[in-house]
């Protein structure tokens, strides 16, 4: 089941999934000056069974130079920079993506892909947060968020992460204001069924997670 909304936004932080659950959509977006081919799919889909999963559909972009747009189609400077590799080969990598049943690994880039990837996640998906360069993390708890089904609605748990500028004089972790969870409820208040899935197996690795899993930043 698709999560109704996107993972929470944390100031000065990016999030990343280590593997994608079946049913996840990745929109076929193209960089400025390019567009999806007319016969091209709207998105790629993580599909398969418990033993093998892969991305269905291929994203393809074609030049939109012949097509009217309301803005110039010259690639912006940030769109001209090379995309960083999606390979995650650091020895600190906690779990091999391919070893998680029913999950897809990060799909390889396609030609003229947009600089930001837009995913539609499914219930049980976990994403991990890290502060962007120039900011450091103040942790009150796990820097992760999980899409859960509660009372028949989906919601993302609130990651306990604050990113502060290296040069700023900031509060000590003990002085942080507690961050409210969605709908103003504490996380522990679960008076009805909460649906999560097999991502519990990844919770232990959050504490040891290094920057290696963020080698690809789509921003």
């Amino acid at each position: 089941e698709l999560c109704d909304d996107d993972p929470p936004e944390i100031p000065h932080a990016t999030f990343k999934a280590m593997a994608y659950k079946e049913g996840t959509m990745l929109n076929c977006e193209c960089k400025r000056g390019f567009r999806r081919i007319k016969s091209g799919s709207l998105y790629m889909l993580c599909t398969g069974n418990s033993s093998h999963s892969s991305w269905d559909n291929q994203c393809q972009c074609t030049s939109s130079a012949t097509r009217n747009t309301t803005k110039q189609v010259t690639p912006q400077p940030e769109e001209q920079k090379e995309r960083k590799t999606t390979e995650m080969q650091s020895p600190m990598q906690p779990v091999d993506q391919a070893s998680l049943p029913g999950h897809c690994r990060e799909p390889p880039p396609w030609e003229n892909e947009a600089t930001e990837r837009i995913y539609h996640f499914v219930v049980g998906q976990m994403v991990y947060y890290q502060c962007v360069q120039g900011y450091r993390a103040l942790h009150r708890g796990p820097a992760e968020s999980v899409c859960k089904m509660t009372h028949g609605k989906t919601r993302w748990t609130q990651p306990q992460l604050i990113c502060t500028g290296e040069m700023e004089t900031s509060q000590f972790p003990g002085e942080e204001k507690p961050q409210a969870s969605p709908e103003g409820r504490p996380e522990s208040e679960t008076s009805c069924l909460v649906t999560t899935t097999d991502f519990q197996i990844q919770t232990e690795m959050a504490a040891t997670m290094e920057t290696s899993i963020f080698t690809t930043e789509y921003q």
């Epitope: 799919s41 559909n57 309301t70």
Partner: antibody, heavy 114, light 107 residues
Framework: QIQLQQSGAELVRPGTSVKMSCKAA????????IGWVKQRPGHGLEWIGD????????NYNENFKGKATFTADTSSSTTYMQLSSLTSEDSAIYFC???????WGQGTPVTVSS | DIVLTQSQKFMSTSVGDRVSVTCKAS??????VAWYQQKPGQSPKALIY???YRYSGVPDRFTGSGSGTDFTLTISNVQSEDLAEYFC?????????FGGGTKLEIK
């Protein structure tokens, strides 16, 4: 909570134009395409086209080229569709939709009558 | 343009029954098909994406299947609130197109 809020019903004269709006809330407006769909009784649903608010890219169904024009205002997270040279054939309910058709607005009824 | 044909405009069923709504595409669309439910006076509600994946909040009595050109939406244990019109849609290629709709009537 993700919502698409559309403007109210329109009663317009033949030959004129109408501009309707679709205000998005609860998600990053510039990340997702906004599509427009026409529904007439007995004619089912027709995809008019879509617009990407982040770059104002547009796609139009050939049947609606010259009839529909999409614009987007990122400051108010609002997408607009203008229909021109209206005839009775344009009397319909118009829906906006986003996030790969997962979310739909409540619809804007347009009646073209003299 | 790809034409989607929902051959049955009306289907009649009883509460507790199982009913299958079909949709045939004029050419191969892979699994790039969605199903929508529209109740009178309301906007369409997304039920199924990619032929067989349910949206959140959609009861598991709704099941989608098929690929290529033939698709089916099955409603098992039909409830009175399932009284609605059901549309299929392809988004395999522009222009995206919809089926003509199938109205489900409850006896």
């Amino acid at each position: 909570q993700i919502q698409l809020q559309q403007s109210g019903a329109e009663l317009v004269r033949p030959g004129t134009s109408v501009k309707m709006s679709c205000k998005a809330a609860g998600y990053t407006f510039t990340n997702y395409w906004i599509g427009w769909v026409k529904q007439r009784p007995g004619h089912g649903l027709e995809w008019i086209g879509d617009i990407h608010p982040g770059g104002s890219y547009t796609n139009y169904n050939e049947n609606f080229k010259g009839k529909a024009t999409f614009t987007a205002d990122t400051s108010s997270s609002t997408t607009y569709m203008q229909l021109s040279s209206l005839t009775s054939e344009d009397s319909a309910i118009y829906f906006c939709t986003s996030r790969n058709f997962a979310k739909w607005g409540q619809g804007t009824p347009v009646t073209v009558s003299s | 343009d790809i034409v989607l044909t929902q051959s049955q405009k009306f289907m009649s069923t009883s509460v507790g029954d199982r009913v299958s709504v079909t949709c045939k595409a004029s050419q191969n669309v892979g699994t790039n098909v969605a199903w929508y439910q529209q109740k009178p006076g309301q906007s369409p509600k997304a039920l199924i994406y990619s032929a067989s994946y349910r949206y959140s909040g959609v009861p598991d009595r709704f099941t989608g299947s098929g690929s290529g050109t033939d698709f089916t939406l099955t409603i098992s244990n039909v409830q009175s609130e399932d009284l609605a019109e059901y549309f299929c849609q392809q988004y395999n290629s522009y222009p995206y197109t919809f089926g003509g709709g199938t109205k489900l009537e409850i006896k």
